[in-house]
């Protein structure tokens, strides 16, 4: 805090308030009688900036120039020092240092609407740290001038509050801006324009669109626009794309045909304006409109695949699986599924519409050649029925391919790698890898995957609905006409060892070997595709190494027998269960003793 | 933004001496630099004296040793004595008022008042 200057005056020049690198000087001088007691030559006055000395001078004035002061306000006090007493505060000064405006930049005037006012925008350019008084001037034709005024440290923008009438509409106007502050001032160049130049129109309005004859083929967008609107661009894209497409439309009086929308898609519409070819600015986008197509008939065929299983001597079930259309081929909400199951000797047939799955099981005779025939339906039609006609589709083994295998690919996806079948492969149409999840009861509930390949391919890579640890079981068909042949294999696409082994629920004797059942592991304990078993036994409280017996695993299996325990002694077995990455755990431990005679 | 009132103009012979008056009101706090300008017709407007809030002066040459300003910070009141008053001394009187505002100074301006000096 500067106290009052009861014991001198500062003087500052030119003034408290200067421009950045200029001088200031500054004069510090005592009173009468208010210099230290005895005579002046003791007086020895000291200028401080802010807390540190950097000028005195013995007498009753002190004069100082001083340079190189930094933006902003910087404290000047003047102290007296007398012989044995401490410094006297004499008077203080703030001084100011900022910039003169630097000359506005890239002034533009933009009027929005017909019936919108003139405003104008400019860069200020380096900041004063000074009131700055902006000053625009507008100059018109028959000498009119309006003038406006913003007297602000920020001021970047005025409204001179006019509107420009059309009239005229290739009458220049003038615009300037001048800045002003206590250090100096500076005006921008002049900007030169017409009412064409600088009328932005308003956005377009209440926008519509209609499909006459719910048709996405005849399509009509409409909009309201200004009076003196020549141009419109028209830009839409489907709602889930980030891509736009773009139209430049002349004379459009608020009416356009659009000829590619897509069926059943949801779009987003946006119009700009703009009132001259080549003057003036475009308006801001419109609101958005934002309207679905009507939907066509699907196009495509369904994908459909399908699995036989025996029931007994007279029957088999059928079990029919389709994939979805995609989007552009369902081309609207898929209502049903239409099933056609005809015997194509006795012209039977039966259909069903199938609404909510993409599968269906049936039960039909064993006898007869049978076909089926697959259509998806929307409001507006169906699609074209994918036939098939019900084979064996393992029956022929000369078409059955070769050597097949399977290989994890990085995360989950497996690679299936086969070679053509012995018969001449060229006979190959195509090829089906299909794959579900291993349950040991062959459960026929197990979701069904498939994909197709061309005859010239012998690998595929399957990557839908594939989980780490988890054991597929795949086959690789070849079809040929009416004929078809399989190999099949297991897969995983990630494994490790099991958590757990084979729970042993029975050991029974038959004629002197045992007979050791077991309980699988569940699914979720495997870890990828089991390989062996093996059962340990070793004599009970004995600390020799156990015995084993390695079984190769098969899906069906869940008991083995053993041949080489002596009778009469105590056994204790267990088993584990081994992938391609290790061996479980233990599973649980088993005693046995045999009572059949020694050998 | 502070409101400026400024008194105390009128018509004086040359050789006669007056006191101008103006005082801040509204938000007056931080008020670091009061100033006195002058606008003589046709001409620009001119820094005549100057006052810090600590007290340190600044004079124009052309007044120096015949005006002197003073403040008084408590009640936001600053004063020009003039004396010794020449016919070129004739304007309008503009009190201003600098305020911090940040790091930037934020001006204020009075409405004016004459002051016409006879020979």
């Known amino acids: 805090k500067i106290d009052a200057c009861k014991r001198g005056d500062v003087t500052v020049k030119p003034s408290h308030v200067i421009l950045l690198g200029s001088t200031v000087n500054i004069t510090c001088s005592l009173k009468p009688r208010q210099g230290c007691f005895h005579y002046s030559r003791r007086n020895k006055l000291i200028l401080y900036k802010f807390d540190r000395r950097i000028n005195f001078h013995h007498g009753h004035s002190l004069n100082s120039q001083v340079t190189g002061l930094p933006l902003g306000t910087t404290l000047f006090v003047c102290k007296l020092a007398c012989i044995n007493s401490d410094e006297i505060q004499i008077c203080g000064a703030e001084i100011f240092v900022g910039v003169a405006p630097e000359q506005p930049q890239n002034l533009s005037c933009i009027q929005k609407g017909e019936q919108g006012t003139v405003a104008c925008t400019w860069e200020r350019g380096r900041d004063t740290h000074l009131y700055t008084e902006y000053t625009l001037q507008l100059s018109g034709p028959k000498n009119l001038t309006w003038q406006k005024q913003c007297k602000d440290i920020y001021c970047d923008y005025l409204d001179f509050g006019i509107n420009l009438t059309p009239e005229s509409p290739e009458s220049n106007f003038t615009a300037k801006v001048t800045a002003v502050n206590s250090l100096g001032s500076s005006s921008s160049l002049p900007s030169t324009f017409t009412f064409l130049d600088i009328v932005r129109p308003l956005p377009p309005w209440d926008i519509r669109i209609k499909f006459q004859k719910a048709s996405v083929s005849r399509c009509t967008l409409y909009w309201r626009d200004e009076g003196l609107v020549l141009l419109n661009r028209l830009r839409y894209r489907p709602s889930n794309s980030r891509l736009w497409n773009m139209v430049n439309v002349t004379k459009a009086k608020g009416r356009h045909d659009l000829l590619d929308l897509k069926p059943f898609t949801e779009y987003e519409f946006q119009i700009s304006s703009k009132l001259h070819l080549y003057k003036g600015s475009w308006s801001d986008w419109s609101e958005s409109l934002r309207a679905q197509t009507p939907e066509e008939e699907p196009t495509g065929m369904l994908d459909v695949w399908y699995m036989k299983r025996h029931i007994d001597y007279s029957r088999q079930q059928i079990s029919l699986f389709w994939k979805n259309l995609s989007v552009s081929e369902a081309r609207g909400k898929i209502l049903h599924y239409q099933v056609t199951l005809q015997e194509l000797t006795g012209g039977k047939a039966m259909t069903q519409n199938i609404t909510g799955h993409t599968s269906w099981t049936t039960v039909i005779p064993r006898t007869g050649n049978w076909a089926v025939a697959v259509s998806a339906a929307n409001s507006k039609g169906s699609s074209l029925p994918t036939r098939i006609n019900i084979m064996n589709l393992c029956e022929a083994g000369l078409l059955a391919p070769r050597q097949v295998s399977a290989n994890s690919e990085g995360m989950d996806n497996i690679l299936v790698t086969w070679q053509p079948p012995r018969k001449d492969p060229s006979a190959v149409q195509e090829y089906v890898v299909e794959w579900r999840e291993l349950h040991p009861g062959g459960d026929t509930q197990v979701p069904l995957n498939w994909l197709r390949s061309r005859p010239y391919n012998v690998s595929a890579l399957i990557s839908e609905n594939i989980k780490s640890y988890i054991c597929y079981e795949i086959r690789v068909y070849a079809l040929s006409g009416d004929q078809g042949g399989c190999s099949s294999i297991l897969g995983n696409s990630k494994h490790k060892a099991p958590l757990s082994g084979p729970h042993i629920n029975a050991i029974t004797e038959e004629k002197g070997s045992i007979l050791i059942s077991w309980n699988s592991i569940p699914v979720q304990e495997q870890m990828g595709c089991l390989l062996h078993y093996r059962i340990y036994w070793k004599e009970r409280d004995s600390n020799s190494q156990p015995q084993l017996c390695e079984i190769p695993y098969r899906v069906s299996q869940n008991s083995h027998p053993i041949n080489s325990l002596q009778p009469r002694v105590t056994y204790v077995l267990w088993m584990t269960a081994l992938t391609a990455a290790g061996e479980s755990s233990h599973g649980n431990e088993r005693e046995f003793c045999l009572q059949g005679k020694a050998n | 933004q502070v409101q400026l009132q400024e008194s105390g103009g009128g018509l004086v012979q040359a050789g006669g001496s007056l006191v101008l008056s103006c005082a801040a009101s509204?938000?007056?706090?931080?008020?670091?630099?009061m100033s006195w300008y002058r606008q003589a017709p046709g001409k620009q407007r001119e820094l005549v004296a100057e006052?810090?809030?600590?007290?340190?002066?600044t004079y124009a040459d052309s007044v120096e040793g015949r005006f002197t300003i003073s403040r008084d910070n408590a009640k936001n009141i600053v004063d020009l004595q003039m004396n010794s008053l020449k016919p070129e001394d004739t304007a309008v009187y503009y009190c201003?008022?600098?305020?911090?505002?940040?790091?930037?100074?934020?001006?204020?301006w009075g409405q004016g008042t004459q002051v016409t000096v006879s020979s």
């Open positions: 201003k008022a600098d305020q911090n505002y940040g790091d930037s100074l934020r001006s204020s």
């Open positions: 006052v810090s809030r600590g007290g340190s002066t």
């Open positions: 509204g938000s007056a706090a931080l008020i670091f630099l």
